[in-house]
């Protein structure tokens, strides 16, 4: 039976075996097409999610779909039920926390009182002034906290205590990519990790350790990528893996926060990268130990220069490295997080591509996660 399962797939009606390599090859080999069912699936960007959180103290903003304008949520009459609705609109199922924060002097959006209508937040029609003088600061999930803060140095061995959201994504027990835990059910990674193998069965996630081979594997229920855009083939390098069973969080298994929608990082902002990838460009071997390194945001104009990526870095990507080169992500680090620390750790980028590893004019290129928040929320909502 083990041999059969490893090399063959059972089609139903009529019952017969097909070679496992025919799974998810794009051709319907079983009469009912079930060989193409448990495969990497694409999901469109979907409609605009009508709530979002700002980097200004994680304050809640609500979209008026009639005008397309965004408004800040006033704390007046804001309830736990409204907080849960807001978080559900973003696809979260966990219990949120919220508090009042003072309206700041730089508040540039109109502030409105919030109500609920058919499980979506709405602005109260006859909204008067915000009497409390406070906005809603909302956290849908406790995230981005680790037991240990890394030291700012070049490249060094990492501890899972510092990066409890880091996972190894493996195909047939071989490490292929990194990834980040976003919540008990979901792991964030890069779409290109699944180009070679699009069947879900053989993919596993390993969490909770900084050593590659030493932790139990978790079954994957679904792998979802964003709809492919032929105009920008390198864009949309983002994937979500839904785990078959929710993770139990601990000191070494925790989620990282998604970035705020307005998380604009200026050049030279310090960031962190981690992974088990190659330590040399053509080193041919994964690192057994998780490695960490500090890098910085590199200006997209510089990154797109003639001696660098010549316009291939789009608005949905970002570059990071160090100006003199030598510190970079490499093969095997793909899908892992590019991280920024404010109050919590945020995954601002996903290791995506680059020419070589560590070259001074060709730094690492990362999927800009803030460009895909809408897609992430729509996937989560569809899977709630």
């Amino acid at each position: 039976k083990v041999i059969l399962d490893k090399y063959y797939f059972l089609c139903g009606q009529p019952l017969h075996f097909i070679p496992r390599k025919q799974l998810c090859d794009g051709e319907l080999d079983c009469p009912l097409g079930e060989d193409e069912e448990h495969c990497v699936k694409s999901f469109p960007e979907g409609p605009a999610v009508a709530v979002r959180l700002s980097k200004d103290r994680s304050t809640l903003q609500v979209l008026d779909s009639a005008t397309g304008n965004w408004f800040s949520a006033c704390f007046d009459n804001f309830t736990e039920a409204l907080a849960e609705t807001a978080c559900r609109q973003m696809g979260y199922s966990s219990k949120p926390t919220f508090r009042a924060v003072e309206i700041g002097p730089d508040q540039d959006l109109d502030v409105v009182e919030i109500t609920e209508n058919s499980q979506e937040l709405r602005m109260r029609n006859s909204s008067g002034p915000c009497l409390s003088g406070s906005l809603v600061s909302l956290h849908c999930l406790a995230c981005g906290k680790s037991l240990k803060t890394p030291r700012v140095v070049g490249v060094e061995e990492a501890s899972v205590d510092s990066w409890p959201w880091q996972v190894s994504i493996q195909y047939d027990k071989q490490h292929v990519c990194g990834g980040s835990i976003l919540d008990p059910h979901w792991v964030l990674t890069a779409a290109h990790c699944f180009r070679k193998h699009t069947d879900v069965f053989n993919w596993k996630v390993r969490a909770g350790s900084d050593k590659l081979g030493s932790f139990p594997s978790l079954a994957v229920a679904k792998i979802i990528i964003i709809e492919f855009n032929p105009m920008y083939p390198k864009d949309n390098d983002i994937a979500l893996m839904k785990l078959q069973f929710p993770l139990t969080f601990s000191g070494t298994v925790r989620p990282i926060c998604l970035p705020f929608f307005d998380e604009e990082l200026t050049p030279a902002t310090p960031l962190w990268i981690i992974g088990w990838g190659f330590t040399k460009q053509n080193g041919g071997k994964m690192s057994d130990i998780l490695l960490q390194a500090s890098v910085q945001v590199i200006d997209s104009t510089r990154c797109n220069a003639d001696d660098a990526y010549q316009g291939e870095v789009t608005e949905k990507m970002m570059c990071a490295g160090i100006p003199e080169g030598g510190v970079d992500t490499c093969q095997g680090d793909s899908g892992g997080p590019l991280m920024y620390q404010s109050d919590q750790w945020h995954v601002v980028g996903i290791v995506s591509w680059g020419y070589g590893c560590g070259g001074p004019s060709t730094p690492g290129v990362y999927t800009k996660v803030s460009a895909y928040l809408n897609w992430i929320y729509n996937v989560w909502k569809a899977e709630l």
Epitope: E27, G33, P230
Partner: antibody, heavy 119, light 107 residues
Framework: EVQLLESGGGLVQHGGSLRLSCAAS????????LHWVRQAPGKGLEWVSS????????YYADSVKGRFTISRDNSKNTLYLQMNSLRAEDTAVYYC????????????WGQGTLVTVSS | DIQMTQSPSSLSASVGDRVTITCRAS??????LAWYQQKPGKAPKLLIY???NKDTGVPSRFSGSGSGTDFTLTISSLQPEDFATYYC?????????FGQGTKVEIK
């Protein structure tokens, strides 16, 4: 087996309209980018239009923009090309093609359908 | 639009010959280049994508190389079934554009 079967070609007057269809079978239709590519008699290949799996992204060659409309019906496994205001230079064999998963290039093609525009 | 120029336009060769076709882009296209083979009265067939990756089922005698603006398709030992027209195509920017084709004929 992946199959793409174009239909709807034929002779049409200058300024007229035609609707090409491409019936697909043997693959997970709704997961793939689809394309129309044409070839004028004795000439080279010309990309005409592309449509992404859920129709979110649609692109046209400048030569057909505003006159041709690509669409797909994932429930019927069919790709369409609505061609209006046809010109003599639109005379060609029109191929429908399935894009590979990445980078979306046409890797399965139909046998083509001939469109002839008479002036 | 990005112009693709193939050379030669046609060539005559014998079975067993090594054949090289070149394709030049009017601007840098990184590795976003594909090669197709087309036989008379038939639809094109994808051979090579992203400059050097062989599509499934393509014989090992076909290889692609190059990046930026200059690309090459090589048939290491020409077989009778290889006599056809070959097209390069860039997918760096829409509109996707093809070269004018290279016809490989029997000498």
């Amino acid at each position: 087996e992946v199959q793409l079967l174009e239909s709807g070609g034929g002779l049409v007057q200058h300024g007229g309209s035609l609707r090409l269809s491409c019936a697909a079978s043997g693959f997970a239709f709704s997961s793939y980018v689809l394309h129309w590519v044409r070839q004028a008699p004795g000439k080279g290949l010309e990309w005409v239009s592309s449509i992404s799996s859920s129709s979110s992204y649609i692109y046209y060659a400048d030569s057909v923009k505003g006159r041709f409309t690509i669409s797909r019906d994932n429930s019927k496994n069919t790709l369409y090309l609505q061609m209006n205001s046809l010109r003599a230079e639109d005379t060609a064999v029109y191929y429908c093609a399935r894009g590979d998963r990445y980078p979306g290039l046409p890797n399965y093609w139909g046998q083509g359908t001939l469109v002839t525009v008479s002036s | 639009d990005i112009q693709m120029t193939q050379s030669p336009s046609s060539l005559s060769a014998s079975v067993g010959d090594r054949v090289t076709i070149t394709c030049r882009a009017s601007q840098g296209i990184s590795s976003w280049l594909a090669w197709y083979q087309q036989k008379p009265g038939k639809a094109p067939k994808l051979l090579i994508y992203q400059a050097s990756n062989k599509d499934t089922g393509v014989p090992s005698r076909f290889s692609g190389s190059g990046s930026g603006t200059d690309f090459t398709l090589t048939i290491s030992s020409l077989q009778p079934e290889d006599f056809a027209t070959y097209y390069c195509q860039q997918s760096y920017r829409i509109p996707w554009t093809f070269g004018q084709g290279t016809k490989v004929e029997i000498k």
